[in-house]
């Protein structure tokens, strides 16, 4: 089944057109913005969240020092390019032939081209840090319980096995959360750190993509964990190729 | 691959007891270790688990406080039990996940058998 | 997250069919097992993800359902699959009670 079979809706993404033209029809699924069938059982990829939102209508929408090749997405939305399986095509570019190259969470990686730009290959982002800052509580959360609540978040509501959950670190109020996937650790079927760091991205700002499942609802021993604000840091196989100048 | 328990016994009412959970064949990293009991004559009942790298332990509502699960080595987690009552006879189970995100549980022991009776 | 199965017992002929029935108090998005156990010996998983079936297990168990609602049906019966069968809920193991329905016994005849 590629979806709920019932009501004919898609449980993990709610930017979806589904219908019953499926094989034996069945429900099938198809992303806003590419129309590409998407598998309901698991987190759809972020390029094709993307590129759906994008389409929607606007009004729709011991802590670690990440180190100096880490990227943050600055560059904000942008309507991407995505391969058959969903994947950020290796090179992006705008309606004004502006082109530069992405890694696999579809955040920039060069310096902005024009159309020769040549971008060999999609390289891989293997460490992602999650930087959360918590709403004051009268007291700090106990780390061993934040730390298993956290893992089994990303367990349950993302489908991201714990392996793939580093470490989480705490100091009153920052968290971080770090994901670790390297190329050859990922197994088919499982979800990318990207993907599941891109879920709870949009689920901390109240922007869930889940259909019909209640918003993030983050307890430690019964006491509401309210996130003030999220930075994410990503680190890419490969070190970005920025000029001196943007270094600057 | 496989699982063995080891430690059951016939114990005193509010007496402790811990059990061990053997794996062999199998590196017990990157998979939850699941306690399940059951009660003679009685259906399955979930204790609780451990992820064995992180170390998180999750536990049944009921269970909290009174058992816990740890891993005591790279092949053995253990169920460490407290204040046991009659109501805590049963045969007690490890298991192992699939190693995916869910909990399908495909490796079992063969079980250990706990009788608290005075 | 609280798993109700029916019937408790059921009993059937060779090679007549069983359907047994688990219900979540809540939706579990396909994330349900069901296990077969004999006397005397642990559970075996039969299917996962609501209808695929484990490695090595006949094509006569097949599993169905979505949402809160989920069936087993078993046909062809064999005597060998006299058993007492258990869903489970996989979808979660946090503030819940018992991840496990309460079992059917089916008695092949």
């Known amino acids: 089944h590629t979806a709920a079979q019932d009501n004919c809706t898609c449980p993990t993404n709610k930017m979806t057109v589904c219908s019953p033209d499926g094989p034996g029809g069945r429900c099938q699924c198809r992303a806003l913005g590419s129309g590409v069938a998407v598998d309901c059982s698991t987190l759809t990829s972020k390029c094709l969240l993307l590129k759906a939102r994008m389409s929607a209508p606007k009004n729709a929408r011991t802590l670690v020092r990440p180190n100096e090749h880490a990227l943050v997405d600055n560059d904000g939305l942008y309507d991407p390019d995505c391969d058959p399986e969903g994947r950020f095509k290796a090179r992006q570019c705008n309606q004004t032939s502006v082109c530069w190259c992405v890694n696999s969470v579809g955040v920039r990686r060069t310096d902005k081209g024009d159309l020769s730009l040549r971008c060999d290959e999609l390289v891989r982002t293997h460490h992602i840090l999650i930087d959360l800052r918590h709403r004051p509580t009268a007291s700090a959360f106990n780390h061993s319980d934040l730390d298993a609540e956290l893992r089994r978040l990303f367990r349950e509501r993302y489908r991201l096995h714990p392996k793939f959950v580093a470490a989480v670190h705490y100091e009153q109020p920052t968290i971080q959360i770090e994901l670790r996937q390297n190329t050859s650790q990922k197994a088919a079927g499982d979800v990318d750190i990207g993907d599941a760091a891109y879920y709870f991205e949009r689920d901390v700002k109240g922007e869930s993509l889940f259909q019909g499942r209640g918003g993030l609802d983050l307890r430690v021993r019964g006491e509401p964990l309210q996130v003030e604000r999220t930075l994410i840091y990503y680190l890419d196989e490969i070190p970005p190729k920025f000029s001196m100048k943007r270094l600057t | 691959q496989s699982l063995e328990e080891s430690g059951g016994d016939l114990v005193q009412p509010g007496a402790s007891l811990t059990l061990t959970c053997k794996a062999s064949?199998?590196?017990?990293?990157?998979?939850?270790i699941l306690w399940v009991r059951q009660a003679p004559g009685k259906g399955l009942e979930w204790i609780g688990s451990?992820?064995?790298?992180?170390?998180?332990t999750y536990y049944a509502n009921w269970a909290k406080g009174r058992f816990a699960i740890s891993k005591t080595s790279s092949t053995t987690v253990t169920l460490q039990m407290t204040s046991l009552t009659a109501a805590d006879t049963a045969t007690y189970f490890c298991a192992r996940d699939d190693g995916t995100a869910s909990y399908y549980l495909n490796l079992w022991g063969p079980g250990t058998l706990v009788t608290v009776s005075s | 997250y609280d798993m109700t199965q029916t019937p408790a017992s059921v009993s059937e002929p060779v090679g007549g069919t069983v359907t047994i029935k688990c219900q979540a108090s809540e939706d579990i998005y396909k994330l349900l097992a069901w296990y077969q156990q004999k006397p005397g010996q642990p559970p075996k998983l039969l299917i996962y993800?609501?209808?695929d079936l484990e490695s090595g297990v006949p094509s006569r168990f097949k599993g169905r359902g979505s949402g809160t609602d989920y069936t087993l049906t078993i046909s062809d019966l064999e005597a060998a699959d006299a058993a007492t069968y258990y869903c489970?809920?996989?979808?979660?193991?946090?503030?819940?009670?018992?991840?496990f329905g309460g079992g059917t016994e089916v008695v092949v005849k």
């Open positions: 064949g199998f590196d017990l990293n990157n998979y939850s």
């Open positions: 993800a609501a209808s």
């Open positions: 451990i992820y064995i790298s992180g170390g998180s």
């Open positions: 489970q809920q996989a979808y979660t193991i946090g503030n819940i009670d018992n991840s």
